[in-house]
């Protein structure tokens, strides 16, 4: 026999064969000009001393061979004696090692047998209806085909599906969509209503994620603040890599999970922005505040299931920073200012109260005072900090108020509202008997005591009525209870208590009168 | 070794239909199949062979458009439905299965196993 023509004479080697599941596979065959046609294949397993033989039976029941050697293609013309007007089934033998692998066969017409190509450049990826849908322009001049598609996981083979007839510029296929894994998908084509026609090659991988993009396992921490007011958060765990199937691994185009970090500010709640959204990689520096951090995880399907965590206020206080001064017209406070043309929120709150309740005032951007000071004032009609009571008071600066991430901590104090000076009267003032020259006065705490920071001293005022003569005791603001000695039998005194803050004099308690009585001796 | 077993064969009237079958033992997945059948005092006959995967069938002329061959490789079955059947169909049917396939799917030589034949006979 001549290599061009198909030989019709018995294969040159014995029938021996050998059920293993390596050997030729996928063969296709088609027209490839007006008169000249190829097959190929391919072969699993050592290629070693392996023969190719290319059969075919023509719809007459004749039977042939070509030799291809070692080669996994294989051209012949229309006069190779092979009929390409009419059906013949194909196949190949492959001779290795003494035993005969054998491939599946096509049936087919060679003559209208086009070689299809499977979908080439973009697959368009979308869900719908819970389902899988991908789109792709159809090949030039390829209108018209049936097609197939394989997916895998990682932990599972490949299994075949079918996309149905297509017949338009565009093709599309509708597929399962796994809900926690992801999968590879491939595509093939052929010609439609040519029978027994050949699959092209399967298409390049489309990495497609699961449904619900994996719920972020991660953890922050937070530094301390720093002297700029601002604290760093950092990932203390990296996200977990999604699992991906074997041809997806490396660059995955379409199974990218991104992380976003949404950080919501909850103090100072008048500000013009409350939420910032931000990537994961770029930790962000925040103020004292409190704050909620979501990570929210994302694919090319939408958001996940988002992690929510809570950062609370840093509530280290400054108890000298803050200047406070009560006039006719009402309040001012002063503050070290940050810099130039800085925007302050102050916030306010009762003590002992929930988070929810804090109030705050935005000042337009402010330029520091002659003395490097920071000022915001309220007047008493505005009701601000207007109640007798100890208030947590935390100011913020920015000089880009718009931006979440830019605010730093100037201070956080405490402050006692309303008339603090009469507020903070010590009550029940009472004085025992000590020794023979000594009293021992006692006082119930100051509401000014409540607010840590706020009560400087008490100051016990000690009058002997006979010479007017008037002596003052400084007490510390832990201390409620106060020993004077020196004091002179029959003599009549009175005491008084009050409490200072830092900027304000307290006002007296009601004075109470004693005396040390005169001992008789019998 | 591979033994076949033919059923379905019996007596019917011309233009009636029977459906002969032809069960493997042994995977014959791998095997051209065919049918062949000997009337009394005459050679054995090609009637209809099937490829492997069953895209490929042939058959006689004398029988072209009135039967058909098919295969079900997962039952190891080969069947072969005869329909408006002559007094010329009557013979003994033969399964036979080639491991080969050298030169033609007609040739009875290439066939490498046989079962033991089932009657066929057309009354007119």
């Known amino acids: 026999c001549r290599t061009s023509e198909c030989c019709f004479q018995d294969p040159p080697y014995p029938d021996a064969d050998s059920g293993s599941a390596s050997g030729p596979r996928d063969l296709r065959c088609y027209r490839i000009s007006s008169d000249r046609y190829e097959c190929s294949w391919q072969y699993e397993g050592p290629t070693a001393g392996v023969s190719h033989f290319l059969r075919c039976c023509l719809s007459s029941g004749r039977c042939c061979y070509f030799a291809a050697g070692s080669a996994t293609r294989l051209q012949f013309s229309d006069q190779a004696g092979v009929s390409v007007l009419y059906t013949v089934t194909l196949w190949v033998e492959s001779w290795a090692r003494n035993q005969t692998e054998k491939s599946p066969e096509v049936t087919l017409q060679l003559y209208n047998s086009v070689k299809y190509e499977p979908p080439l450049g973009d697959i368009k990826v979308s869900k719908l209806a819970g389902q899988l849908r991908m789109e792709w322009e159809t090949p030039d001049n390829q209108v018209g085909a049936e097609v197939q598609f394989r997916h895998r996981t990682p932990s599972s083979p490949w299994k075949l599906g079918d996309c149905g007839p297509q017949d338009d510029d565009t093709e599309s296929c509708l597929c399962p969509l796994e809900m926690n894994v992801a999968q590879e998908f491939q595509l093939r084509r052929r010609q439609l209503g040519s029978q027994g026609s050949s699959w092209s090659k399967w298409s390049s991988p489309v990495c497609v994620p699961p449904e619900n993009p994996p719920q972020p396992q991660v953890r922050f921490s937070v530094e301390q603040l720093g002297q700029d007011g601002r604290r760093r958060l950092t990932l203390k765990e990296q996200p977990t890599q999604l699992e991906l199937p074997e041809g997806c691994q490396g660059l995955a185009p379409g199974t990218e999970v991104t992380y976003r970090l949404q950080l919501h500010m909850l103090s100072c709640p008048c500000k013009a922005k409350a939420t910032r959204t931000l990537h994961l990689g770029k930790m962000p520096y925040l103020s004292g505040a409190a704050y909620n951090v979501a990570v929210i995880s994302s694919n090319q399907f939408g958001p996940g299931l988002n992690q929510t965590w809570h950062i609370p206020a840093d509530t280290h206080t400054e108890p000298v920073a803050l200047n406070i001064s009560v006039g006719t017209n009402g309040t001012t406070m002063y503050w070290p200012a940050r810099a130039q043309s800085m925007t302050y929120c102050i916030e306010w709150q009762p003590v002992g109260q929930d988070g929810g309740l804090a109030t705050c005032s935005l000042t337009a951007p402010q330029d520091p005072d002659p003395a490097g000071m920071a000022t915001y004032s309220w007047s008493r009609e505005s009701g601000a900090m207007g109640q007798e009571k100890c208030y947590y008071i935390t100011i913020f600066a920015s000089a880009h108020p718009e931006k979440l991430t830019l605010w730093s901590t100037v201070l956080s104090t405490y402050h006692f509202g309303g008339n603090a000076s009469a507020a903070g009267t010590p009550h029940h003032v009472s004085v025992k008997n000590h020794s023979l020259d000594s009293v021992s006065v006692d006082w119930a705490p100051s509401l000014l005591s409540t607010c840590p920071g706020v009560l400087k001293e008490y100051v016990v005022r000690c009058r002997d009525e006979d010479s007017k003569q008037v002596s003052e005791h400084p007490v510390q603001p832990t201390e409620t209870q106060v020993t004077l000695s020196g004091l002179r039998a029959g003599v009549a005194y009175t005491v008084q208590v009050r409490a200072d803050t830092a900027w304000l004099r307290g006002v007296w308690s009601q004075p109470q009168r004693f005396s040390i009585e005169v001992q008789v001796s019998d | 070794q591979v033994q076949l077993v033919e059923s379905g064969g019996g007596l019917v009237q011309a233009g009636g239909s029977l459906r002969l079958s032809c069960l493997a033992s042994?995977?014959?997945?791998?095997?051209?199949m065919g049918w062949f059948r000997q009337a009394p005092g005459k050679e054995r006959e090609f009637v209809a062979a099937?490829?492997?995967?069953?895209?490929?069938?042939w058959y006689a002329d004398s029988v072209k458009g009135r039967f058909a061959i098919s295969r079900d490789n997962a039952k190891n079955t080969v069947n072969l439905q005869m329909n408006s059947l002559k007094r010329e169909d009557t013979a003994v049917y033969y399964c036979?299965?080639?491991?080969?396939?050298?030169?033609?799917?007609?040739?009875?030589?290439?066939?490498?196993?046989w079962g033991q034949g089932t009657q066929v006979t057309v009354s007119s």
């Open positions: 036979a299965a080639d491991r080969r396939t050298g030169t033609s799917v007609y040739t009875v030589d290439e066939y490498d196993y």
């Open positions: 042994g995977r014959t997945s791998n095997y051209f």
């Open positions: 099937i490829s492997r995967s069953g895209g490929g069938t």
